[in-house]
């Protein structure tokens, strides 16, 4: 795409964008921020949705992994004409509805929400936004907030998962470009490799899952390694160790040669899963090997 760091994680990414009247003269900066960030998530298993809010929330692009649809969605995003109030809660509701209904092959995909706003939310609107963000979290989402210009950081820390999930942009909209790298680093949860990738049939093993962002979980005690065996049975295992760039997990005992286990990771005790193209296969090992 445009070079530089990228994210290979397979999850659902929601952009919830303020298009209220106060961003009227800054929509281009918001668009270019989203466009550049979107191009850095490159897993074929990553799905993306664009949601805009003002006096109501609208799904501009429903959840899709189709890169052509994402390109068209970005074109639609560029055409948005801001105006109206800052009903951020409406944006979260649109995201939650998709999280709730758009599961993949019978399991819920992990969801990351990046919500951007430029103003302070007054009284009821803050209460509503916090409540709807909590409901998104109840469905397994990780919530990040980007605050530009006249935002209230204390409010955004309560809407986001924590203060660490807030990206303040104090120097105005033109400074949005400067946080792309840090947002990418923080919001990316990816599985890159498993060591060993081949294990002996019928024997117990430990697997090192290499990746990034495993400590982004709200509670690292809720991180699970998940093995989808031969596209049917899924076994979840609690890791022995959770570090940001690797997990140490017990591998399930796979009795037969040629069995395949696709690796997934849950950050929330199995409520939802980050997918990958990493596969562990079994082979025949002779005694003493």
């Amino acid at each position: 795409e445009d070079g530089g760091p990228a994210c290979y994680g397979g999850f659902d990414l929601y952009f919830i964008l303020d298009k209220s009247g106060s961003v009227l003269h800054h929509w281009n900066e918001i668009y270019y921020f989203v466009e550049q960030l979107a191009h850095k998530f490159i897993s074929p298993q990553l799905r993306m949705s664009f949601i805009v809010f003002s006096t109501r929330g609208t799904t501009l692009m429903k959840l899709t992994e189709d890169r052509e649809q994402i390109r068209q969605g970005l074109e639609e995003l560029q055409k948005v004409l801001p105006g109206g109030d800052t009903y951020m809660h409406e944006g979260f509701e649109r995201a939650s509805e998709q999280i709730y209904y758009e599961n993949r092959q019978g399991y819920r995909t992990a969801s990351v929400i990046i919500a951007l706003t430029d103003g302070e939310l007054h009284e009821d609107l803050f209460f509503y936004s916090e409540r709807e963000a909590n409901r998104s979290r109840d469905l397994g989402a990780i919530v990040y907030c980007v605050g530009v210009k006249d935002f209230n950081e204390t409010q955004l820390a309560r809407i986001a998962d924590s203060k660490d999930h807030v990206f303040p942009v104090n120097d105005g909209f033109q400074a949005l470009q400067g946080i792309i790298h840090s947002i990418l680093k923080k919001s990316c949860i990816e599985i890159l490799a498993a060591e060993p990738s081949t294990i002996c049939a019928g024997e117990s093993f430990q697997v090192v899952v290499r990746g990034n962002g495993f400590r982004h979980a709200r509670n690292v005690d809720r991180v699970l390694c998940s093995f989808k065996i031969n596209d049917s049975v899924t076994l979840n295992e609690k890791p022995f160790s959770v570090e940001d760039t690797y997990l140490l997990c017990p591998a399930p005992i796979l009795k037969e040669v040629g069995m395949k286990a696709a690796l997934q990771v849950s950050m929330n005790d199995g409520l939802s899963f980050i997918s990958s193209s990493v596969i562990i296969t079994t082979t025949h090992c002779s005694d003493g090997s």
Epitope: K62, E97, Y100, Y101, E102, R131, E132, R135
Partner: antibody
Framework: QVQLVESGGGLVQPGGSLRLSCAAS????????MSWVRQAPGKGLEWVSL???????YYADSVKGRFTISRDNSKNTLYLQMNSLRAEDTAVYYC?????????WGQGTLVTVSS | DIELTQPPSVSVAPGQTARISCSGD??????VSWYQQKPGQAPVLVIY???NRPSGIPERFSGSNSGNTATLTISGTQAEDEADYYC???????????FGGGTKLTVL
Amino acid sequence: QVQLVESGGGLVQPGGSLRLSCAASGFTFNSYAMSWVRQAPGKGLEWVSLISSGSSTYYADSVKGRFTISRDNSKNTLYLQMNSLRAEDTAVYYCARAGFKFDNWGQGTLVTVSS
Amino acid sequence: DIELTQPPSVSVAPGQTARISCSGDSIPNYSVSWYQQKPGQAPVLVIYADSNRPSGIPERFSGSNSGNTATLTISGTQAEDEADYYCQSYDNTSPDLVFGGGTKLTVL
């Protein structure tokens, strides 16, 4: 403005089949989940089925395996194929734009299952 | 599955405040909507996400959700508010949309 118009209701014998349609206009149909809700004579509302914008489908236990919801985004139309109909399926069937709420409803179409 | 319980009927004098309750386990975790249905008509959404009013719905309609009960409040009830009212929510564990049994509001 948003408009939902149901059709296809009528009298059918127990064990028979019927296909309901709902023509939608006034909104971006393919971006919304859509649902069927029914109301038996003199009774309350009962959710029947939902199809998400990405075409994932969900059903109430009472109709699972008998009813099939589908959508044709090119025609802005929602469908409900009802098979193995029973007397207790007699109701007015409403098509509704859905999510966590049903924010727009059609006027309904009456399905009567009787011999 | 989540079950929503409503009183079958509520009566109120014109100009007074009517309160219709909807109870269910863990209801505050879920978004509650309310619908008004008049005889022979389709339901109309009057409150969504616990307390939000769609455009065109009079300000006398309000909603709240706390404890194990969601409440629809109609302040200064008018004769035209006489109708059946249904609460509705969803089940977090499996995609299932649920309605309460309905409450008949009579304006005396």
